[in-house]
C-alpha cells in the first residue's frame, strides 16, 4: 500500500504519500485555530505508471493508454486514498470549542 | 459541476473533464474486445485553484496552502468523480460473452 509506513521509509519516485507540515497561522493565515499550531497534512505526488495502485478500471485503462501513447497528456494522477481527521481547539468569543475536522491528514495515496 | 455538460461546452482551463476516445485495439492492444471498437473514456485535467470543486477538507487546505505558497509542489489534482460503466462483447473460444466493466467512462471531475 502507498501509505506512510511504506512511503516515508522509501525513496519512492512514483506515486506515494509525502510529508507536509502545515502551520495554520503561517501557511494558511488561520489565526483562529489555537491548537495544534500545525499538523502533518501530507500530500500525494509522483507519476502513476501502468497498474500502480490503480483506483478504478478507468485509471488502469488510462495508465495503459499513457504507456502505449507516451505523448498523450492524459494520465492518472496521484491523489489521497485514506484520510484521517484532526481535532482542533478554537474559541467562539471566550468559549473554547473542540472540533474534529474530517479528512485532514493523508495516510495513503492512489492513482486515479 | 465539472461534468461533461459543462466542460465540453466551455473552454475551461481549470480542472474539467476532457474528451478522450480510446480504440481498444490501437490504443490498448486489446484485441479481445470485439464491441465496441472503442469508447469515450474521457479524462480529467487542469489546475485546481483554491476551492475549485474541492473533494475533502484536505484538498481545500492544500488549495489554500498552494495559493499562499505558490512555490510549493503540493497541490490538489484534477481526478475523476463520477464514472459510468461500459458494456463490452468478447469471445471465450467460440462463446460470446457480454460484460459490464465498471468505472470506465469519466462523467465529471473533482480536485482531490
Amino acid at each position: 500500500a502507498l501509505d506512510t509506513n511504506y512511503c516515508f521509509r522509501n525513496l519512492e519516485e512514483n506515486c506515494c504519500v509525502r510529508p507536509l507540515y502545515i502551520d495554520f497561522r503561517q501557511d494558511l493565515g488561520w489565526k483562529w485555530v489555537h491548537e495544534p499550531k500545525g499538523y502533518y497534512a501530507n500530500f500525494c505526488s509522483g507519476p502513476c505508471p501502468y497498474l500502480r495502485s490503480a483506483d478504478t478500471t478507468h485509471s488502469t485503462v488510462l495508465g495503459l493508454y499513457n504507456t502505449l501513447n507516451p505523448e498523450a497528456s492524459a494520465s492518472p494522477c496521484c491523489v489521497p486514498q485514506d484520510l484521517e481527521p484532526l481535532t482542533i481547539l478554537y474559541y467562539v468569543g471566550r468559549t473554547p470549542k473542540v472540533e474534529q475536522l474530517s479528512n485532514m491528514v493523508v495516510k495513503s495515496c492512489k492513482c486515479s | 459541476a465539472l461534468d461533461t455538460n459543462y466542460c465540453f461546452r466551455n473552454l475551461e482551463e481549470n480542472c474539467c473533464v476532457r474528451p478522450l476516445y480510446i480504440d481498444f485495439r490501437q490504443d490498448l492492444g486489446w484485441k479481445w474486445v470485439h464491441e465496441p471498437k472503442g469508447y469515450y473514456a474521457n479524462f480529467c485535467s487542469g489546475p485546481c485553484p483554491y476551492l475549485r470543486s474541492a473533494d475533502t477538507t484536505h484538498s481545500t487546505v492544500l488549495g489554500l496552502y498552494n495559493t499562499l505558497n505558490p512555490e510549493a509542489s503540493a497541490s490538489p489534482c484534477c481526478v475523476p468523480q463520477d464514472l459510468e460503466p461500459l458494456t463490452i462483447l468478447y469471445y471465450v473460444g467460440r462463446t460470446p460473452k457480454v460484460e459490464q466493466l465498471s468505472n470506465m467512462v469519466v462523467k465529471s471531475c473533482k480536485c482531490s
Partner: antibody
C-alpha cells in the same frame, strides 16, 4: 495483408485419407480460432471443423457429418492449420475453405482447395 | 443447434433494383445489445467475402449500398441499388453459440 493458402486437395477414391493444409500469414495466428468450411456441388456453406487458440485449450468442433472421421489440428510455430480427412465418402466432395474468425464472423478466407471423392 | 432459414432461396432482379434478403433464426442470436449475425457474398470460383458483421456493421472495403439490420431472430440484408457485380449467393451466419451455423443461401440472379 492477411493470406490463407490451402493445399492438399485432389481426386481420391472412397475410403482412403487426405490431409489438407492451410498456411496463414499477415496476422497473429496464435491468437485466433481457425476453421474449415466446405461447399459441396450445388449446396451451401457448411462449417465442418473448428479449432480455437491455445488460450482456450485448442478446443475443437466437428459437424455431425464428419465427426470421428475428420481431425482438425494446428501448428502455431508454423502458422498452419490442418484437416486430416479419413474414411472419405463421395458426399465429402467439395471445395474446402480455410477461414479465420477473430470474433464471431469469418473475416478472411483462403481461395479454397477442391476435394473430389470418386470411384 | 441454431437453425438459420433464408428467404427467398433465390430471386431474379435487375441492375438498379433494391434487393432485400431475410434470415430467420430458430432462437435469438442477440445478447444484450449485440446482434451476432453476419452476412457473406459468395461468387462461383471465388472465396466467400464478409459483407456485414454483427447485423449492421459494414466490413472493410464493402460498398455502402450494402446494409444490414435486425435483432433477436429476424435479420435483413439490403442492397440499395443492385450492381452487375452483386449477382452472387448470399449467406447469413450466427455466432450466438457453438456451433456457428450458416443459412441455406440466397442466390441473386439477373432478371
Amino acid at each position: 495483408e492477411v493470406q490463407l493458402v490451402e493445399s492438399g486437395g485432389g481426386l481420391v477414391q472412397p475410403g482412403p485419407s487426405l490431409r489438407l493444409s492451410c498456411t496463414a500469414s499477415g496476422f497473429d495466428f496464435n491468437s485466433y480460432g481457425m476453421s474449415w468450411v466446405r461447399q459441396a456441388p450445388g449446396k451451401g456453406l457448411e462449417l465442418v471443423a473448428d479449432i480455437v487458440s491455445k488460450t482456450y485449450n485448442y478446443t475443437t468442433y466437428y459437424s455431425d457429418s464428419v465427426k470421428d472421421r475428420f481431425t482438425i489440428s494446428r501448428d502455431d510455430s508454423k502458422s498452419i492449420v490442418y484437416l486430416q480427412m479419413n474414411s472419405l465418402k463421395t458426399e465429402d466432395t467439395a471445395v474446402y475453405y480455410c477461414t479465420v474468425a477473430p470474433g464471431g464472423s469469418f473475416d478472411y478466407w483462403g481461395q479454397g482447395t477442391l476435394v473430389t471423392v470418386s470411384s | 443447434d441454431i437453425q438459420l432459414t433464408q428467404s427467398p432461396s433465390s430471386l431474379s432482379a435487375s441492375v438498379g433494383d433494391r434487393v432485400t434478403i431475410t434470415c430467420r433464426a430458430s432462437q435469438s442470436v442477440s445478447i444484450s445489445r449485440f446482434n451476432l449475425m453476419h452476412w457473406y457474398q459468395h461468387k462461383p470460383g471465388k472465396q466467400p467475402k464478409l459483407l456485414i458483421y454483427r447485423a449492421s456493421n459494414l466490413a472493410s472495403g464493402i460498398p455502402s449500398r450494402f446494409s444490414g439490420s435486425g435483432s433477436g431472430t429476424d435479420f435483413t440484408l439490403t442492397i440499395s441499388s443492385l450492381q452487375p457485380e452483386d449477382f452472387a449467393t448470399y449467406y447469413c451466419q450466427h455466432s450466438r453459440e457453438s456451433p456457428w451455423t450458416f443459412g441455406g443461401g440466397t442466390k441473386v440472379e439477373i432478371k
